[in-house]
């Protein structure tokens, strides 16, 4: 397994609709044709696998139908969007990139993007 550099923003604030987007950029050492991107979440001692997609270079990322993630790729950049976030989902979201084919296998893990999610305040009842 060979190491690869992965860059991602340090902090992102989710929108009031619970959507957060960030770019994950990797320094590809070769001409990979098959790339796997995984988003992991770390909060205290819990590390969970949020979503993953494998794509062929030049093609779209395909996440599972029920995934909370969507994304697009452009060269060595992956634009990731996570939706349906609530305040309890605040945490460090780590971008992990694997160059699956052709060999050799490369693995890169970003330092993580701290995503802050603030639940919107309910609208106060108003009398007209």
């Amino acid at each position: 397994c060979k190491a690869m550099h992965v860059a991602q923003p340090a902090v992102v604030l989710a929108s009031s609709r619970g959507i957060a987007s960030f770019v994950c950029e990797y320094a590809s050492p070769g001409k990979a044709t098959e790339v796997r991107v995984t988003v992991l979440r770390q909060a205290d001692s819990q590390v969970t696998e949020v979503c993953a997609a494998t794509y062929m270079m030049g093609n779209e990322l395909t996440f599972l139908d029920d995934s909370i993630c969507t994304g697009t790729s452009s060269g060595n950049q992956v634009n990731l969007t996570i939706q349906g976030l609530r305040a309890m989902d605040t945490g460090l979201y780590i971008c992990k990139v694997e160059l699956m084919y052709p060999p050799p296998y490369y693995l890169g893990i970003g330092n993580g993007t701290q995503i802050y999610v603030i639940d919107p305040e309910p609208c106060p009842d108003s009398d007209f």
């Epitope: 995984t38 590390v47 969970t48 696998e49």
Partner: antibody, heavy 120, light 106 residues
């Protein structure tokens, strides 16, 4: 070389407590979570919980809340799991385990296991 | 919690023959991880992130699947492959393991 050395087998009476240790070596102890897994005789594996040695924050399987308590001693790079109010249902081999790389190769390293027997 | 059900519970295979173990999740998971355990030994990481072989695992083994259905395959079983195989998920807490599949050689 990463090594997780667990304490020896224990025989306890019902209602007693036991503290199992897991001494880590070959890496920076505070860099990785330590997880604990139970295996009752002839049964599958059951995740008990984990501890972040750096922050000492813990996460437990609801099934083991009130039964297991996870702690660490950073000065000796040792993780501990205490089981209280032991019953025959707690008879099992208990393992400590650690991930391979950070965020990759989950549970790549395992201790040799500690057999806890409960008998009057 | 996510329940992982493995099939078959046990299988007996002749050396050189293929073998397949399935792991079905009660709800969708991102990846499946597999462990091998021999009698009296600690489990060993065998396949992680669905398809990546752990260090030292022969390439006769492969892992595949997505969503709720995952498979561990052995192209040609050898004597040393005997043991119990467990699947595990890390998509949501509590982390859970499969029921286990015992592989024996004929």
């Amino acid at each position: 070389e990463v090594q997780l050395q667990q304490s020896g087998a224990e025989v306890k009476k019902p209602g007693a407590s036991v503290k199992v240790s897991c001494k880590a070596s070959g890496y920076t102890f505070t860099d990785y979570n330590m997880d604990w897994v139970r295996q009752a005789p002839g049964a599958s594996l059951d995740w008990i919980g984990n501890i972040n040695p750096n922050s000492e924050s813990t996460s437990y399987n609801q099934k083991f809340k009130g039964k297991a308590t996870l702690t660490v001693d950073k000065s000796t790079s040792t993780a501990y799991m205490e089981l209280r109010s032991l019953t025959a249902g707690d008879i099992a081999v208990y393992y400590c385990t650690r991930d391979g790389n950070r965020y990759d190769a989950w549970f790549a390293y395992w201790g040799q296991g500690t057999l806890v027997t409960v008998s009057s | 919690q996510i329940v992982l059900t493995q099939t078959p519970l046990s299988l007996s295979v002749s050396p050189g023959e293929p073998a397949s173990i399935s792991c079905s999740a009660s709800s969708s998971v991102t990846y499946m991880h597999w462990f091998q355990q021999k009698p009296g030994q600690s489990p060993k990481s065998w396949i992680y992130s669905t398809s990546i072989l752990a260090s030292g695992v022969p390439d006769r083994f492969s892992g595949s699947g997505s969503g709720t259905d995952f498979t561990l395959k052995i192209s040609r079983v050898e004597a040393d492959d005997a043991g119990v195989y467990y699947c595990q998920q890390r998509t949501s807490y509590p982390l859970t393991f499969g029921t286990g599949t015992k592989l024996e050689l004929k």
